[in-house]
Structures are given as C-alpha cells and as structure tokens.
Interface confidence: low
C-alpha cells in the first residue's frame, strides 16, 4: 500500500508568492511559493495519486504583515481552503499567547492540530480541551494512518505560551501515544512536529513504532540529486535513520517559507512496515500556475493589509537616525531603538534567579536602511518601518560562547571606516574599541548585561561562558562576514518578523525618544 505525504513547515505567513530568497515578490515571473501556487500542485497530486496526505509541521504563524494584521485568521482560512489533513503546533503559534492560538486557529481549523508533548493545566485545561490533540487517526483510501504531533520543548523561551502549558520532552511524551495507536490497530504512524532536525532524527531513532518523521523548526533542506534553487542540502531526501529496534525510518523536512512542497512516497506492507520511501521537495516556481480561485481570495484579503500599512503605530519625538553615515560608523539611536525592541520582544521566562533569559542584542548597521524624520508630526507607520527594515528578516535567538562574541566584535571593526555593513549596533552590551590597534585586536572592553541577577548590571564578558543573544537571521546565517557566528553557534531558534517586533514595541511605548547613550565607544 502506497502513501503520498505532502508536507510544509515554517511557512511563516508567506501566503503570497515571494522572491527566490523568500522576501517580497518583485518580479512575478521569477517568484515562488504562495498558497495559490501550492494549491495547484497539491490538487494535481491529489488527482493523480490515490492516497495523499497534506501535512504541516508548524510555524505557519509570524513572518509578514499578513500575520501582523490577521493574527492567524489567515492561516486557518487558507489552510482550510487547501484542505490540509493535519498540522503540528510550532513555537510561533504561541506568539500572541494561548488566546491568539485558540480563537483564530484552533477554533477555526477544519483539520486536526496536534501536539502530544504539550499538556494544559489549571483553568486552561478545560478551555483548550479537544482543541488540539496528541494524535489523530486519519482515513486514507481503505487504510488508516495515525499522526502524532510534537512541539519544541524550548517554546517557553521562544514564544509566549504562558504558565498553564507544560512542554514535555518530545520522546517521553510521544512513546505512550504511539503505543496507544498500536493498541488501536493503527500500524502506520507518522510523527509530525516542530522541534528541529536533530530532534526529528532522535525521534526516528528512539520512539518505537514511528514509521516516518515529518519535521520543521530548523528550516532543513534535504534533497536527493541536483538541488533546483539556492538552498544547499543538509542531506538526502528522505534522510534515513536506523532506529534502535533496527528499522529504517525516513525523516523529512521541506526548508521553509512555502518555497517547496515536500513530496514523500512511502510503501507499506500489510503489517504496516515501511518497505520503501523516496521523493524530493518540489520547488514551487513560476512554472506552476497560481490557482485563480485562491489567488482571487488572496487579493481580497490583501486590501486590509494595504490600509494597515499607512496607519499610525506610534510617535517619535526625536529624529530616528538610521542613516548609513551614522549606523555604519558609530552608535545610532535607530540601532538602539531596534535592539531595545528586540530585547523587549523576548521578555519571558523570568524566575527568582533570572530577570530574563536573554539581555543582549547585536544588529549589523548595514541592515538599517533608512532614517525616520520626526517632523512628519512624529508619526511612525508600518510603511516607514518597512523602509528601515526592508529585507523581511527575523530576529532570532542564538546561544554563543563569549569567545565567539569577542570574534564578532573584532569583525565589526576589522575594516572600520569604509561604510561597510558589519559595524554592530547593540543592546545590553557596552563595547569599547581602540581603532589605532591592528584589526583583530581592537576590542579593549566588552561588558554584557547580566541575566542571572535581580538588578541588571554590566559585567565583563567571560570567554568560556555560554550567552543568549538576539540578532537578525542574516547574522545567524553568517551574513556580512560573520562566519564565526554561523560556524560556532551552539543553538539557533528562528524568531519573529523584524518589522513586527519593532512595530509592536512602538505601539506598546506609544511615544519613543531613543538616545545615543554610550553603548559603543
């Protein structure tokens, strides 16, 4: 019996087609992805093949103005339209709190939403009961397939799930659910979840009875043969893991941003054992037409976005200096504003030991593309912020050793004075450079804001300590020459859309007046 698994993950609000790098579509003939194009391909496969499941491995939320405006209603609407069969909860599904998940998505989705390792407690338990499930048994043709969900146990550090959801260890939580499915005579089981490729592989290895793992979170691109676009494969598709009980378990992921549709064909024997698996992600490029009906729906929903982008978010009473001549040479108040917003967006998980789990931000000055003039009545709009941060990136959370941070700050000024983009703006960091010294030895003082303290203060950076830092995904991926970050990072979790982070902060503060205050000397 053959099953076709179509899968997406980390779509992050890319409802409309995008450019090849998943930013805003400029030249439509070269654009990719989007739900209208995805629908065309899915329907084509559904017609051609008898047993098809369309699955999403989480993080539909967060990433473009679509999420900012519609807050998840757009996810439910268009996933319903595409007739997804199941979705696993990702960490970003909690970005607007549990209410922001329940109302727009859990209550509106016409497909099961899954996570076996999230347990509700207290008053939330009854409110959320039945709205997401640990597993779901789906009829596919004349057979039955069990789908069991999982979500990153780091979610409390990455999003806003509140205090009434407990995120258990994935493997510990999955095993009893898989065992339960087995007792129900369900012998074909897919683990669908959002914990990253390393955890996906562990699940394949450790959870008895899981036949296939469909993952997300790490934006992993797997491919067999010559890849069709810019993404470099992290391994073959499917990636085969040998389980502890000797089975060959295929593990798949489909990069991110709806650029590819994962396509995996699995052959099962009559006892539900995987006999063979093969496939590849399908690049959703312009050779695949956009479905006109879905496209028309997208255009209808778009109208509200255009209106939103000109509305006032808040006011500034000072000039927001985002000029190249400032931000690529010295501390600039636009850099301070953005870093403050980045830290504010990550205020979570305080306890009696820590006032926050992260206190530091770095931001490449070249990523700041425009100032905002306060003389326009002080008004700040989404449109203004889109000019400052036009690349559609995210502000991510990484863990780095102090020694890596030191290298990053040396790189920041290794060719100082040429208006290059790598000059770092900061938050929760005090850095002193001596530009008379030779490149690679210019950082003379580097103090960082403590997190394990009741009164935050600046302490000297320790080379062997592990620090959490918020930074643009561009830097986490080694952009502007920050190869040491990419090579040496110990953990990387994707964060929220850059403009959204800043706009939320401005809306919260209402009136802003960021200063140049001696963070960089």
């Amino acid at each position: 019996w053959e099953l076709t698994i179509l899968h997406t993950n980390d779509v992050h609000s890319r409802l409309e087609q995008t450019s090849e790098d998943s930013s805003k579509c400029v030249n439509a003939s070269r654009c990719m992805g989007g739900v209208a194009r995805l629908f065309t391909k899915v329907q084509q496969i559904r017609r051609a093949e008898p047993n098809v499941l369309l699955l999403d491995a989480g993080d539909q939320y967060q990433g473009t103005i679509w999420f900012t405006v519609y807050k998840g209603a757009e996810v439910a609407h268009f996933m319903n339209a595409l007739r997804y069969d199941a979705m696993a909860l990702g960490n970003h599904e909690f970005d607007n709190g549990v209410e922001g998940l329940i109302e727009p998505l859990l209550k509106e989705a016409k497909f099961p939403i899954l996570s076996a390792n999230i347990k509700a407690k207290g008053p939330l338990a009854s409110q959320i009961s039945g709205l997401y499930l640990p597993y779901k048994v789906l009829p596919v043709g004349d057979e039955v397939v069990g789908i069991v969900g999982y979500t990153s146990k780091e979610t409390p550090f990455l999003s806003n799930p509140g205090t009434n959801l407990v995120f258990e260890d994935e493997i510990t939580a999955l095993q009893p659910e898989v065992d339960k499915l087995k007792t129900l005579n369900v012998n074909k089981i897919i683990a669908l979840g959002h914990s990253g490729f390393e955890t996906d592989k562990l699940i394949a290895q450790k959870v008895r009875g899981v036949d296939v793992v469909v993952g997300g979170h790490s934006n992993t691109f797997l491919y067999t043969g010559n890849p069709p676009s810019k993404e470099v494969p992290a391994g073959k598709y499917p990636f085969i893991v040998t389980s502890d009980d000797g089975r060959k378990v295929p593990v798949v992921q489909a990069y991110a941003f709806g650029k590819y549709l994962g396509y995996l064909k699995i052959e099962f024997d009559e006892r539900g054992n995987v006999i063979s698996s093969h496939g590849n992600p399908i690049l959703l490029n312009s050779s695949i037409p956009e479905d006109p009906s879905i496209k028309a729906d997208i255009n209808k929903w778009r109208i509200k976005l255009d209106n939103y982008s000109t509305q006032e978010l808040g006011k500034t009473i000072v000039y927001l200096d985002g000029s190249s001549q400032s931000c690529r040479f010295r501390e600039c108040n636009m850099g301070n504003l953005i870093c403050d917003a980045m830290i504010n967006n990550n205020l979570r998980h305080a306890d009696e030991m820590f006032w926050n789990h992260v206190s530091m931000c770095i931001l490449n000055g070249g990523g700041i593309r425009s100032p905002i003039d306060e003389r326009n009545n002080g008004t700040i709009t989404w449109e203004n912020l889109a000019a400052v941060l036009p690349f559609g990136g995210t502000f991510d959370l990484v863990q780095l050793k102090g020694s890596t941070l030191k290298k990053a700050f040396e790189h920041s000024v290794h060719r100082y004075g040429q208006s290059t983009g790598e000059f770092l703006q900061v938050g929760g960091i005090h850095v002193v450079y001596d530009l008379s010294r030779k490149p690679g030895d210019r950082v003379v003082k580097l103090d960082v804001l403590c997190t394990k303290c009741r009164v935050p203060s600046y302490d000297p950076l320790k080379m062997d300590e592990i620090y959490k830092v918020i930074l643009p995904n561009f830097l986490a991926n080694g952009g502007d020459g920050f190869q040491m970050i990419k090579d040496e990072l110990l953990r990387h979790d994707s964060g929220d859309q850059d403009i959204n982070v800043v706009s939320t902060y401005i809306s919260k503060m209402k009136v802003i007046y960021p200063a140049v205050e001696g963070r960089i000397k």
């Epitope: 007739r83 069969d85 199941a86 016409k110 009906s293």
Partner: antibody, heavy 121, light 107 residues
C-alpha cells in the same frame, strides 16, 4: 441562512437522463463538498458521490460509476447531478447535502429539500 | 465496501422512555460515524458525528457511543418530536454507506 435549494420533480422515461440542480446560499460555496444521496420510496439512504466545488474534483460510488456525473457552476453557487440510462429502480428522492471539505470531522450538516425523480414508461 | 447494519429495524416506545439503537459496521470505521434523524417527507437532519459529538442545536438527550465496528445512539428520555427514522452513516472509505434505518414509533 445556510440552505440548499433543489430543482423540482421530474418524470422520465427509461433510458433517458435526468439532471437535478442544487443551489447553495448563505455560505462560501467553494469551501464545502456537495454530496448526492438518494432514497427510494420506503427505503434507506444511498450515497452516490461528491464534488469539491473549488476545483471540480469528484468521487463516485462504484455502483453509479459511468452513469452519474456531478458538476458545479461556481458563478451561481449551484451543483448538478446527472444520472443517465435511467431505469425504473432509479425512481427515488434525490438529495444534495453539504459536507465539510476537509479531513477531521466528516458529516452532512445541511441537506436540500429533495427532488423526486420518477422513471416510468 | 463497508456495510452498515442497524438494529432494530423498528421500535415502539413511549414518551419518557430511554431508547438505544445500534449500528454495526462490517469493518472498523474508527469513529468516523454520523447519526441522522429523518421525518416523513423531510430531508435527514444531522444529530451526531465522530460517533459521539453532538451537532449544533441538537438536544443533549441524544448521545452516541462506541468504537471500532459497534456504535450506539441513545435517547435518554423520548420526547414526542423524537418519533422518526434514524440512520447511521460511516465516513471511513468510500462508499460512505448508510445503515438500513430504525423506525421509532409511538407505542
């Protein structure tokens, strides 16, 4: 409110075809499957097939394969069921019924009022 | 194809009675089962789906149970408006067959 309104009764000769319409209102027509079910006098219900209006994808019960054709006109939110090569045992009330167009919870939640088709020489 | 067998085919009961109708599938339908009520000359009306979930607007005296191949519809206290014919339907694999029906009449 959400409703399905079917065309009127038909009398047909054996060997002829009949086309019954089902006009939807009060909801987004393209978001739900339309199914056809028939019921001979004093008998039970018999599922015939379904269509997903957004793209015209159909699935028919094997028993009716080759004789039944389900179509839609989305511009007027109407589904059609055509049954050909009619015989006397096709005399029945034919219902259209709306189904959620997604896996998860499956059921027919809204039904048309029924169309009586009589096949008689 | 999965066949659905309902029992009894007819049943006489009084107002206030507790009534149980069963539906047996020839194969496991994994709770993908709906119950409908039909009155003479009318279209069927959805009562329950997923074997036990009450449809919107249906009185709580109706309940469903079961799993695998055996399912039950229970009316805890019959009301005059409940006298009708009841059908089960599975949504496992096509064709989505109905049971033969149970006619519930006033004793």
């Amino acid at each position: 409110q959400v409703q399905l309104v079917q065309s009127g009764a038909e009398v047909k000769k054996p060997g002829a075809s009949v086309k019954v319409s089902c006009k939807a209102s009060g909801y987004t027509f393209t978001s739900y499957d339309i199914n056809w079910v028939r019921q001979a006098t004093g008998q039970g219900l018999e599922w015939m097939g379904w269509i997903y209006p957004r793209d015209g994808f159909t699935k028919y019960a094997q028993k009716f394969q080759g004789r039944v054709t389900i179509t839609v006109n989305t511009s007027i939110s109407t589904a059609y069921m055509e049954l050909s090569s009619l015989r006397s045992e096709d005399t029945a009330v034919y219902y259209c019924a709306r189904k959620e167009g997604y896996r998860g919870d499956w059921y027919f939640d809204v039904w048309g009022q029924g169309t009586t088709v009589t096949v008689s020489s | 194809d999965i066949q659905m067998t309902q029992s009894p085919s007819s049943l006489s009961a009084s107002v206030g009675d507790r009534v149980t109708i069963t539906c047996r599938a020839s194969g496991n339908v994994h709770n993908y089962l709906a119950w409908y009520q039909q009155k003479p000359g009318k279209a069927p009306k959805l009562l329950l789906y997923n074997a036990k979930t009450l449809a919107s607007g249906v009185p709580s005296r109706f309940s469903g149970s079961g799993s695998g191949t055996d399912y039950t519809l229970t009316i805890s206290s019959l009301q005059p408006e409940d006298f009708a014919t009841y059908y089960c339907q599975h949504f496992w694999s096509t064709p989505w067959t109905f049971g033969g029906g149970t006619e519930l009449e006033i004793k």
